[in-house]
Each structure stands twice: as C-alpha cells, then as structure tokens.
C-alpha cells in the first residue's frame, strides 16, 4: 500500500489555445486529469488500473502552480493504491478548459481539451522527487512525481506491513525496509522479550520488563546470584539455598545463639571488663568510678557513703570531700578529737575513756551501732528470712513472718521435717515425734544453730604501742586503751598535729 | 517506626505493690544497645528517671528507688514490667516508660499512664 | 546526684523573637552528656537535642544547643507559634539520670 505523488509546477498556454487550435474565451480556465495505470509500452485509452484523480482549476493560460499540501493536500496530487508497487507505470495527464463550474467529463465539450501527455517508465519507491517537463506544440508542463508508501507500509514495494507498537504483543518501531527494531531494553523476534538487569543470573533470576532482575525462590541480591540461607537463619550462610552454616562465635539451628556477646557486640564502656555469661548474655566488671549494666553512667562518689561518723560527703569535679562534724578530721572523718567530755555517743550509748581521756569508746544500746551509736541498725538489710518470709523490724530485735508450710525463727523449717535443712551454719537436723532437733558443729548454737559464739576479736593484737586491747563481746569488736602520747583507733598515731594522710 | 505503651492500674491502694508493663510494637525488645527504661512524672512537676533494663535482663536503678522497685523483661511477649512495692501518695504520677538507644538519650515514649495512689 | 537547675522558669516572648533557655547542673557534666526535651500538655516529652549540640532528625534548624562542664543553652532562634511549650534539659553522664525542672516557654 503506497501513494503515488504528483506536483504540478508550472503550465505554459502562452497563446490562450486549445488543442484543436481554437482560443478560449476569455482565457483558458485551466484545470487537470491525471490517469495512472498498469505499465504500458504504448500508452493507450482505458481503465485508470492505478486510479485517478482531478484537480479543480488551477489558473488561466500560462501559470505555476502552488504546493498546497498543507491546505487541503490538493497539490500534490495524490493517487493511493492498496497493492504492491510493481516498479513501473503508466501516466496519462491531460490539461483541460472549464467554460463553467461543472468539471464533470459529461458536462464539458469534446474540444475543450488543451494538452495531453503520455509517459511510461520504472519508478522506486523512494523519498526523492523525479522532475519532468512535457513540450508540445503550444503548451508546456513542468511537474515532478514519486512514490511513497502509506504508513506502517514498508520496503521496496510498500509490500512490508510494520506497526510499531509497545504493548504486551511486541515494543518495536519499523525500520526503513520494515524489518523490526526493537525498543532499548527488548529483544526477540517480536521484541517480547526483556533484556534483563546486566548480570542477572541466568538460571537463578529473571525479568518481566527491561533493566529487572527478579529471583527465583531460593535465590536474593541485586543479580539474583545470592542464595537466602534458612528462614530466621541470624548469622549464618549458605552456598545453596534454605541452607544456615554459623558464622564463628554462633551456634544454634538458626545460628541465632550468640556464644561471643562481648566480642560481636562490646557492649561495656568506659574500659569495663566484658564476660560472656551465656547465650546472648553478658557481664560488665566496671573500673572504679562507673556503674549501670554496660558502665555506661558515672557514679557518684559519695554513693558509696565514704564519709564516717556523721560527716556529709560533697561531689566534687575531681572526686569528693568530707565535712566532718565538730570533733573528727581526716579524709573520711575517722578521726576523733573528742573525749567522753565532749557527750559523743548518741541514742543512750555509755561512753569509756580511753587512753587517759584522750580518746573513747561508745558502748550502744541494742539497735543502734556506729563508732557513736548513730546508726540505727536495721536487722532486716541482710533478708535473714528464708522462704520468702517477711522481715519485721521490732525495737531491739528483728522477727520473720512465714508463708504458709514454713516455721523456726528465720522461716528456715518446712514444717514439721529436715527436708530444707533447717540448722544453719552447717548443723545436723534430727527428725523427732515433736519437731526436730539440730546439732550445731563448734562455734555456733541456738535452737537452730543460728547463734555464733563469740569469737576474741583481740586474739590478732590489733592494738599498736602497747596499747590494751578489750574485746566488745556484743559485737564481736575490740577496742584499744591508748597508753599516754598515743591516739587513733588502733592507738596507731602519735599525740600532735592531726596526721596527715597519705591517701 | 517502633512504638512503645504502658498498661497497668490507674489506682492503687497505699501500701500495695504497683505493677506496669510496658508493650513494645513494630520494633524487637531483642535490639542489644537499647536500655528500656522507666521515667515518671509527679502532677505539675519534673520528670525523674525510675530505672532501665536491657534485653538480657541486666538492670540499674535510681538510688532513690532501689530498695523499692524491680524491672523485669519477657522478650517472648516484647514487654518490660515495673513492680513499686510499699507505695504511698507520694508515688502518684504519671509513668512513661521510653527507649534509649545506646545512651540515656530517650528517643521513644509511650504515651504515658497516670497511676494514683490512694485508698 | 547531680542537680540540674533551668532557668527562667518561666519565660515571656513573642513570636518571631529568640527564646534562650539556661541550664545548669550541680557538677561538671562529662562528655557534654547533655539532652532537651520538648513536652506539649497531656503528651510525652520530646527528644529535641543530645550530646548537648546535636540536632534529632526532624527537628526544625531553629533549635539549637550550646555549652559545656555545667553551662547549657537551648536557644529557638525565631519563635514560631507551636514552639511555646515546656522544654527539659537533662543530663545522662552519671548515675542517677537527672531532669531539670524545666522552663515554661509562653506567649506575650
């Protein structure tokens, strides 16, 4: 399927004449038929096989002929045909006067014709106009023609149907000889088949439009060229799929058991010590000066309530300080300048002179303890209860309030057997009728063996210079009678300035 | 984007035990590096940090609130709990509970849950 | 315990004007471990600012943090209208982790 394309150019009639020689009145009104038809060697009368066309008129006498294909396409004339080009023609044009408007052939006179030419020849399809000029004896036409084929219509003869397209059937344009040229990304006879992401493996990936590359199961990564190990694999690989080989310092069915927390993880600061404690546990040993899980926070030095006998502790940028109270010095206010004199024993605590009166001793009252009886004890910050039992503070002493099933003073007896061994510190527990009974090894007693025996606590000579040492048998403490010119706990400083220390 | 929400009694009685927990959704309570912590914030005032947990069960508590409370954590439910026994008037607040994510820079809260304490 | 004081308590502006908000702390804060926060009434606070400079993703440039040892600032360079709130600083070098009391930020 094509179009054969003639362009009227110029016609000359200078002599205003017809063909039989008689002149047009005013002046030829000029107008034209074109037939085309099958090749011929002698051109000759009959059906216009290849079609025909007219134009209306075009001017009078001598005159050129404008293109007009962009109002209305009248000029060139156009001559489409739905058949293969066969590369020869025939063309019959024929210049004709209108006396009125009617151009029918029918309506018009046998004489009114002008001119008549006749040509025949090979012609390729092809872009490029063919120029030609006919001469007769009072007339010349110059015009020039060619054959072009009709769109989506390709090839030598316009015998080629090619319409690009860019849907799931193919995504292709047409080529000069209307063979197909696919769209950038597709490939295949029809242009049907994506060209996938560069790379993408061959057997392991595929694609559904260009530049993809999608996996087949089993398979991940941008080219497909990774295997996915087993669901909820953690930290481990594979080489095929559904695989899960543990990376090092990993255990587990899904490698998800971490036997190295501090390694993979350091999760300790500020210098900590880390211990694996255990599948995906850990613990930090924190420097001096740090607390929290990891060592992560700062402690506060005075968290650890340095200061003694009374004295308030004070942050510090570089640490902490003592204000001690009136009657002690050094760096934890563990220094006393006061004497029995002075009422230094709180809570009804007796003072005793030492070292001829200059130093003391606080003997307290059962619940309270300190070097002046100024702490209060709270018998239950050791939880002496077992099994659960409530501790109950009561005046001097402390008393535990069993669960349901449990007896004996600190909640340690299952009721009325041996079964959670019931004697402390060690005792044989005997089963009798009415309860039982413990026998306690050496150093403790009580019904439950939960009562040590004093021990001498100046059996080490914790005193220094000849000091006389005195054992505190309520608290299992000594205390040291200073010889004159000599103070300090352990009569350890000679009497003067307060000692400066070296810590 | 990790979301986290308190759940819990809004009224105890003096002297009992308060119990929260707090749920964590769209995100794993497993992440190492988190602390997940506990904050509350008496009516019209400040805000005092309570204490952290972390995955592996290791905690560090306020001073202040130590010998009263415990952090618990169930990493198969994605929760932390908190448990403030002998609590008085004083304990009244509202609780968050929130994440850090590696320091005690609290990037996520929940929404907060007002507990009275009153009999 | 390291006490954080914030100071003004209360502070009066217009929008459109600079907000400066001062807080102090007790001790030396290390490594400018040093945090704000946003609160609006009846929500959870908001991380604004940590390591005493550094600015969350999603928080407008008009926020910013300055200082050092006890000496913090948060400053709101122009004031916008959902920006008069109550703001936190705390502070999360040492243990216990402290909070301010905090500064009301109201509209003139």
């Known amino acids: 399927s094509g179009v054969f394309q003639l362009q009227l150019q110029e016609f000359i009639n200078e002599r205003g004449v017809l063909a039989s020689g008689r002149p047009c009145e005013p002046g030829c009104r000029t107008f034209f038929r074109v037939c085309l038809k099958h090749f011929q060697a002698v051109v000759s009368p009959g059906p216009c096989t290849f079609g025909t066309v007219s134009t209306p008129v075009l001017g009078t006498n001598s005159f050129a002929v404008r293109d007009d294909s962009s109002g209305g396409g009248r000029n060139p004339l156009q001559l489409p045909f739905n058949f293969t080009w066969p590369g020869t023609f025939s063309l019959i044009i024929e210049a004709w006067h209108a006396p009125g408007d009617d151009l029918r052939p029918e309506a018009l006179p046998p004489d009114a014709l002008i001119s008549k030419i006749a040509i025949q020849g090979s012609l390729a399809v092809g872009q490029n106009w063919l120029l030609d000029e006919q001469t007769s004896t009072l007339t010349r036409l110059r015009y020039s023609y060619r054959v072009i084929c009709s769109d989506n219509y390709y090839g030598d003869n316009c015998s080629r149907l090619c319409k690009k397209r860019n849907d799931h059937f193919g995504h292709y344009v047409c080529q000069p000889d209307g063979n197909l040229s696919c769209l950038p990304g597709w490939t295949g006879e029809y242009c049907q088949q994506p060209i996938c992401l560069s790379g993408c493996h061959e057997q392991n990936g595929y694609c559904s439009k260009p530049a993809e590359c999608l996996c087949r199961p089993g398979w991940q990564g941008r080219l497909c060229n990774e295997c996915i190990p087993h669901n909820g694999c953690r930290h481990g690989t594979c080489s095929t799929p559904w695989q899960c080989t543990c990376d090092e310092g990993w255990g587990g069915l899904f490698c998800d058991q971490d036997l190295n927390y501090c390694t993979h993880h350091s999760p300790c600061k500020n210098g900590a010590t880390c211990s694996n404690s255990g599948q995906r546990s850990y613990t930090c040993t924190c420097r001096p000066g740090y607390t929290g899980v990891d060592c992560e926070l700062e402690l506060s030095e005075c968290d650890s309530n340095p200061c003694r006998n009374g004295g308030s502790c004070k942050d510090q940028e570089d640490g902490y300080h003592c204000l001690c109270p009136p009657g002690y010095y050094g760096l934890h206010c563990e220094h006393s300048t006061l004497s029995c004199a002075d009422s230094p024993c709180f809570n009804g605590g007796s003072c005793r002179e030492r070292n001829q009166g200059a130093n003391y001793a606080c003997e307290c009252p059962p619940n309270f303890t300190g070097s002046n009886c100024e702490k209060k004890v709270d018998r239950c910050t050791s939880n002496p209860c077992a099994n659960g039992g409530q501790c109950l503070n009561r005046g001097p002493s402390r008393m535990c309030r069993c669960r349901p099933g449990f007896t004996g003073t600190y909640c340690e007896l299952h009721v009325s057997d041996c079964a959670r061994n019931p004697c402390a510190h060690g005792g044989t527990c005997h089963d009798l009728e009415n309860g039982l009974m413990c026998t306690c090894p050496a150093g403790f007693s009580g019904r439950r063996c939960e009562v040590r025996t004093s021990i001498d606590a100046c059996a080490s000579s914790p005193c220094f210079n000849r000091a006389t040492c005195y054992t505190d048998l309520s608290t299992d403490t000594f205390v040291c009678n200073c010889p004159y010119g000599f103070v300090g706990s352990r009569c350890e400083f000679p009497v003067g300035l307060p000692p400066s220390f070296p810590w | 984007q990790i979301t986290l929400k308190e759940s819990g009694p809004g009224l105890v009685k003096p002297s009992q035990t308060l119990s929260l927990t707090c749920t964590v959704s769209?995100?794993?309570?497993?992440?190492?590096?988190?602390?997940w912590s506990w904050i509350r914030q008496h009516p019209g005032k400040g805000l005092e940090w309570i204490g952290y947990i972390k995955y592996s069960g290791g905690v560090h508590y306020n001073p202040s609130l130590k010998s009263r409370i415990t952090i618990s954590v169930d990493t198969s439910k994605n929760h932390f709990s908190l448990k403030m026994t002998s609590v008085t008037a004083a304990d009244t607040a509202v609780y968050f509970c929130?994440?850090?994510?590696?320091?005690?820079?609290?990037?996520?809260w929940g929404q907060g849950t007002m507990v009275t304490v009153s009999s | 315990d390291i006490v954080m004081t914030q100071s003004p308590g209360t502070l009066s502006l217009s929008p459109g004007e600079r907000a400066t908000l001062s807080c102090r702390a007790s001790?030396?804060?290390?490594?400018?471990?040093l945090a704000w926060y946003q609160q609006k009434p009846g929500q959870a606070p908001r991380l604004l600012i940590y390591?005493?400079?550094n600015r969350v993703s999603g928080i407008p440039d008009r926020f910013s943090g300055s200082g050092s040892g006890t000496d913090f600032t948060l400053t709101i360079s122009r004031l916008e209208p959902e920006d008069f709130e109550l703001y936190y600083c705390q502070q999360y070098s040492r243990s216990p982790i402290t909070f301010g009391q905090g500064t009301r930020l109201e509209i003139k």
């Open positions: 390591g005493t400079s």
């Open positions: 001790q030396s804060v290390s490594n400018n471990y």
């Open positions: 769209d995100g794993s309570i497993n992440s190492g590096g988190s602390y």
């Open positions: 929130a994440r850090a994510p590696g320091s005690h820079t609290f990037d996520i």
